[in-house]
């Protein structure tokens, strides 16, 4: 059919129409991390499961070595939740003792690395003081937003203290992105 | 017109292109819940408003009996916020009294039920220890991520204690999903 | 080319297919706010950066005077995070002194204004009691959901106390929307 032969070029000429199902997408889930020593201003990157359970990558969105690799330029929605858990932070006692009033905290940062740019870019940050009394504590930090990314950009999730990340369940700590 | 007759098959032959406006979508809002007995490891499902106010379902995404029914296979973004409110949890006193150091908590789980699969799958979990001092408390837990779902899958939102859910406003507690 | 002349009407006649890249989208980031007097039931709107750094508006989605202006009807995903920070709220002391047991709180509301409708509509609310002990505190509230909006609708983000908003970094406090 003449019409059938014409269709593909018709599609290309007039608009970058595309099937939604072939857009780059990924949902990564937590795995056990190396419990590293916690240093104040050094935020280690999490590593992730990319194919087992609920995790997947598709349509050229690849995961390698803690990074999601962006395969084509466009606007992406990027999200992550990290569930933290820890022992009681006795900051009330610290305060009473007259020491500096800087609370303990938990922080998640979604970072973009562009090879042609020397510095990583912090896209999203969730940071929370932790001043719990009387118990072990646990809580999530959720982040999500839309960003214009370039082909070759790399995304990672950094945390303030890797040893506090709850790695036990794939539904508690996760990281994803999809082309809009 | 001959062209009009041809168009649908033209669309099918080359790519599963589709109008964005006809994709399954739903945003459900909170309603008053039936107060149920709170059991430790049994998380009841919330029921929802699906057509009044801000709530809607469209394009074959249906809500019935606490479930969102997925009408076609694909990648969906699923989200929920539950606002909890409660009386003070005196876990600091509990601790001082030497009882077990297990904090009170609030939890939201977005669960997928597949009829052909015996066990529900937990897609997303937000869980937070609650150890407030000196006051009534209230706080939201937000969740959102992308999942590959199959036609016929059912989604629900479960919570650790239905009596703590703030059902007073449609903007405080909600549940939604849309095909990407 | 005859084919080229025909293409647009062919597209309109059969389905509202469109290039994803030309959909209205915006991601706004925090800027320093004008400190306003804090009134209990009056929630001031934040203003935003719309073109520097990570911020952008595109495809007729415009930002003006604290509002995102919706350029076409459809279903939008709308999101915001506001990071708050403050001094210790001694609500435990307040309680001990026998004064009313109403905790301090932080609240974010995403509001829709429709010129033809007298009252703004609250689309999303995140509200949290703040009863910290022993330290300065900081924490984010994240919101996101899908809504059916009409051309000409305006969106804004309101907060319970503008002086508590962390305006220091574009990744901590932000506001966005995109047509699905």
């Amino acid at each position: 059919l003449k019409g059938q032969e014409f269709a593909p070029s018709h599609q290309q000429v007039y608009a970058p129409l595309r099937a939604d199902g072939d857009k780059p997408r990924a949902h990564l889930t937590v795995v056990r991390q190396t419990p590293t020593q916690h240093f104040k201003n050094q935020f280690p990157a999490l590593h992730w499961e990319h194919e087992l359970g609920l995790a997947f990558t598709k349509n050229r969105m690849n995961y390698t070595n803690k990074f999601l690799l962006i395969p084509e330029s466009g606007d992406y929605f990027i999200y992550s939740q990290v569930t933290f858990r820890g022992m009681t932070s006795e900051c009330s006692e610290i305060r009473q003792a007259g020491r500096p009033n800087k609370p303990d905290s938990i922080t998640v940062v979604i970072t973009k690395v562009t090879d042609s740019y020397p510095e990583p870019t912090q896209l999203l940050m969730g940071t929370k003081s932790v001043c719990e009394v009387g118990s072990n504590w646990f809580q999530p930090i959720y982040l999500g937003a839309m960003f214009s990314l370039q082909e070759g950009d790399k995304l990672m999730v950094n945390v303030s203290d890797i040893s506090l990340v709850d790695y036990t369940k794939e539904d508690k700590t996760f990281f994803g992105a999809f082309l809009l | 017109l001959k062209g009009q007759e041809f168009a649908p098959s033209h669309q099918q032959v080359y790519a599963p292109l589709r109008a964005d406006g006809d994709k399954p979508r739903a945003h459900l809002t909170v309603v008053r819940q039936t107060p149920t007995q709170h059991f430790k490891n049994q998380f009841p499902a919330l029921h929802w408003e699906h057509e009044l106010g801000l709530a809607f379902t469209k394009n074959r995404m249906n809500y019935t009996n606490k479930f969102l029914l997925i009408p076609e296979s694909g990648d969906y973004f699923i989200y929920s916020q539950v606002t909890f409110r409660g009386m003070t949890s005196e876990c600091s006193e509990i601790r001082q009294a030497g009882r077990p150091n297990k904090p009170d908590s609030i939890t939201v789980v977005i669960t997928k039920v597949t009829d052909s699969y015996p066990e529900p799958t937990q897609l997303l979990m937000g869980t937070k220890s609650v150890c407030e001092v000196g006051s009534n408390w209230f706080q939201p837990i937000y969740l959102g991520a992308m999942f590959s779902l199959q036609e016929g899958d059912k989604l629900m939102v479960n919570v650790s204690d239905i009596s703590l859910v703030d059902y007073t406003k449609e903007d405080k507690t909600f549940f939604g999903a849309f095909l990407l | 080319l005859k084919g080229q002349e025909f293409a647009p009407s062919h597209q309109q006649v059969y389905a509202p297919l469109r290039a994803d890249g030309d959909k209205p989208r915006a991601h706004l980031t925090v800027v320093r706010q004008t400190p306003t007097q804090h009134f209990k039931n009056q929630f001031p709107a934040l203003h935003w950066e719309h073109e520097l750094g990570l911020a952008f508006t595109k495809n007729r989605m415009n930002y003006t005077n604290k509002f995102l202006l919706i350029p076409e009807s459809g279903d939008y995903f709308i999101y915001s995070q506001v990071t708050f920070r403050g001094m210790t709220s001694e609500c435990s002391e307040i309680r001990q002194a026998g004064r009313p047991n109403k905790p301090d709180s932080i609240t974010v509301v995403i509001t829709k204004v429709t010129d033809s409708y007298p009252e703004p509509t609250q689309l999303l609310m995140g509200t949290k009691s703040v009863c910290e002990v022993g330290s300065n505190w900081f924490q984010p509230i994240y919101l996101g959901a899908m809504f059916s909006l009409q051309e000409g609708d305006k969106l804004m983000v309101n907060v319970s106390d503008i002086s508590l908003v962390d305006y220091t970094k574009e990744d901590k406090t932000f506001f966005g929307a995109f047509l699905l």
């Epitope: 795995v31 056990r32 419990p35 590293t36 590593h47 087992l52 820890g86 040893s163 506090l164 | - | -």
Partner: antibody
Amino acid sequence: QVQLQQWGAGLLKPSETLSLTCAVYGGSFSGYYWSWIRQPPGKGLEWIGEITHSGITNYNPSLESRVTMSVDTSKNQFSLKLSSVTAADTAVYYCARGQVGTTDYYYFYMDVWGKGTLVTVSS
Amino acid sequence: DIQMTQSPSSLSASVGDRVTITCRASQSIRRYLNWYQQKPGKAPKLLIYAASSLQSGVPSRFSGSGSGTDFTLTISSLQPEDFASYFCQQSYRTITFGQGTKLEIK
């Protein structure tokens, strides 16, 4: 050469609390997961749980309500408490070091084990 | 929890034989699988990690293979010191072990 030395009471009555300690010699205490595993007589291995140097724990859900683990980083020691024991808790209890490694992906294994402590629960 | 099923539960063989023990996971675990050897009255000893990597100091007659749900431990030529029990263990989620395979002298 890392070695794990463990000790604790070997004979308990039902409803008592089992208490074991494991000391780490000749190696780093941080950067690893410190596990407890048990093996009833003539049976297979059951993982009880683990703890990190910072005191973060992860327990087997089937035992979680009765288990408490703790660390003493000043002594490079970690401990297990199992409350309300019954005859079904009779087993050899092992401590072990777990570590995360990497090739093209991540994995986890327990490469150093204590000699084991037989704990018998009997009235 | 992920269930690990080993087969056979016991096996008789002779010195010099080639022996294969299999382990099946109840869901895909990619290569999150380890093999341990345990002799009577002793603690388990790590042989293979990540399904096929040989632990330092373990003789090369031991090898592991498999991915997803099906895994194999192979001893290419049995030596007298190899008669023991063998356990597989998954480390993808909450750690679980197989029920064990007892390798005895024929």
